[in-house]
Amino acid sequence: QPPPPPDATCHQVRSFFQRLQPGLKWVPETPVPGSDLQVCLPKGPTCCSRKMEEKYQLTARLNMEQLLQSASMELKFLIIQNAAVFQEAFEIVVRHAKNYTNAMFKNNYPSLTPQAFEFVGEFFTDVSLYILGSDINVDDMVNELFDSLFPVIYTQMMNPGLPESVLDINECLRGARRDLKVFGSFPKLIMTQVSKSLQVTRIFLQALNLGIEVINTTDHLKFSKDCGRMLTRMWYCSYCQGLMMVKPCGGYCNVVMQGCMAGVVEIDKYWREYILSLEELVNGMYRIYDMENVLLGLFSTIHDSIQYVQKNGGKLTTTIGKLCAHSQQRQYR
Amino acid sequence: SAYYPEDLFIDKKILKVAHVEHEETLSSRRRELIQKLKSFINFYSALPGYICSHSPVAENDTLCWNGQELVERYSQKAARNGMKNQFNLHELKMKGPEPVVSQIIDKLKHINQLLRTMSVPKGKVLDKSLDEEGLESGDCGDDEDECIGSSGDGMVKVKNQLRFLAELAYDLDVDDAPGNKQHGNQKDNEITTSHSVGNMP
């Protein structure tokens, strides 16, 4: 079945082109040889001009970008929303963990509260900063918490007869905290639990944010001129022959898209691996690898660590009395 | 053992949590996210097919356009002729991905490496050292409220792990996504949708 003869007046082509580019007189009145065309190479007279061809190419690339954006819309929404929800949820967990820990101090060790609240607050601020990607070392965070707590525990609970603490004794007590391992293995235990759970949490959030970046990159891809020419030939060149209602062949479309998307499709292998690796990570996020579990239980572990200090109070007070005698003498003067 | 900080439950939001019908933990939300993401596992390989199915393509017509002429839909010419004497499609593929795509591939490689190193091997969730330090003491089943604490006498059950997500101000169901709906379909490796794209012929 031969193709229908082209529109003798180019009227149909004109009215369609008018929708793309209102008011421009680029469409020939009647079919022309079209020897200047570079994409829609004519087999006979054509209703297209070089200017029209350029406009078609622009429109084709724009259409392609819109199609790509609509393709990724649901996926993009899924990751963006979840990244936001998890970030907020993690902040809520941190806030509750802080409140739990403060409540533990208030209910069990009221004499420590003003200073303990400050140290606990700083510790959980660091936890938040770490989750959001700051370069803090978890061991340093935990050490700092116990370094700060011990002088207060010693001067308020174990040796309350001391005069108002001055820097000297506090500094000696900070040193003694590590040298004498006054909290036993609790700091180490907390370091292990907190670092494992926070590392996993942080990488989980990082992965979600990278997912957003991947989709955004795909979303805003600019297609090459070659691709623009292929798309124009597929979607618009038929109009030049007055074939307004005809559609591209399916197989042809697939070949063109494979060509245009050759680069993008290369992401596929790594994208699959990304989802499967994320799944593996999520499957392992429980017990000490689950920050919700670990942080909400910190108040209990910190409580146990203070009980450990109290249990060894007598022995510690004697040792510290000798170790920090110099600082104490200076204080009494 | 530690005084359980009940007095914290004055937060109205948390009071609300206790009465949530469909309770969710962070871990259930994570698993739900993974299931949804897995339906997009073929997203990139399915893109060319997706775009063809969402731009005008001859489906029921006998004749279709192959880039040069009108041909019968099932003829050899339907896919081939439009490419002849135009420009080399192979050349286009040989150029390789543009820098921005290469960059994103590098970032994916990096995060995949990180994710793999961070993934917990099955059955090794508890380190030996932690086990010895009493992390596992106390009798807590996996399906019950998780046990939290480090030593026997300090063990506390945190009631149902707070169900934090009920507290969040917005709901996250993708069904409520703005715009048109679209679903990844794993079975046929194709993404289907109901968008209309502007400016299409």
Epitope: L129, D135, I136, D140, E144, R178 | -
Partner: antibody, heavy 121, light 111 residues
């Protein structure tokens, strides 16, 4: 008495290297983050670098990244700043400062008296 | 990393009050990060006046107070005294935990 004493400053030609030291006393050095801050003649304070209590985390200003290296020896209670590829704009009084926190930068609550570094040909 | 913004100078008569502002961004003064204030006399090392937005170290007179709101912080000196004439610097840290100082404000006590 809490004290910080810088040393190692002096006149140096552009492109050359210099190593500053800061001896700490009167406090538990290994418990605190430490900093180097500089002040060019007649100018404001410019933070240079910091290191966490354990030395595991280090931080640098953009202007010195890749040229300067901060380190500490907790057994000797000493902080160091290795300055390579020095430029005229590195001329300043370099202060060593102790942070009130251990894990990262917060507030600098003890300062040394400073050591002058002059980079000139 | 860019410096925090402070006015170059401020002045007041003895007994009056002076407030110095310090403006940053959501990644330094805003967010989780704390603001500190320092006093520096010519040829001397700086001295910490305020930490954690509003806390005074021991030995700092209560005439000095600090506050923070959003991405701005301020230092207030009430009952200005002659010895308060000095340079004042605000300081915070950014999301990469790098320290950032303000450009400094010269406070002059008049009369």
């Amino acid at each position: 008495q809490v004290q910080l004493q810088e040393s190692g400053g002096g006149l140096v030609q552009p492109g050359r290297s210099l190593r500053l030291s800061c001896a700490a006393s009167g406090f538990t050095f290994s418990s605190y983050a430490m900093h180097w801050v500089r002040q060019a003649p007649g100018k404001g304070l410019e933070w240079v670098s910091a290191i966490s209590s354990s030395g595991r985390s280090t931080y640098y200003a953009d202007s010195v990244e890749g040229r300067f290296t901060i380190s500490r020896d907790n057994s000797k209670n000493t902080l160091y700043l290795q300055m390579n590829s020095l430029r005229a704009e590195d001329t300043a009084v370099y202060y060593c400062a102790k942070d009130r926190r251990g894990s990262h930068a917060d507030a600098l609550n003890v300062w040394g008296q400073g050591t002058l570094v002059t980079v000139s040909s | 990393q860019s410096a925090l913004t402070q006015p170059p100078s401020a002045s007041g008569s003895p007994g009056q009050s002076v407030t110095i502002s310090c403006t940053g961004t959501s990644s330094d003064v805003g967010g989780y990060n704390y603001v500190s204030w320092y006093q520096q006399y010519p040829g001397k090392a700086p001295k910490l006046l305020i930490y954690g937005n509003s806390n005074r170290p021991s030995g700092v007179p209560d005439r000095f107070s600090g506050s923070k709101s959003g991405t701005s912080a301020s230092l207030a000196i009430t009952g200005l005294q002659a010895e308060d004439g000095a340079d004042y610097y605000c300081q915070s840290y950014d999301s990469s935990l790098r320290v950032v100082f303000g450009g400094g404000t010269k406070v002059t006590v008049l009369g």
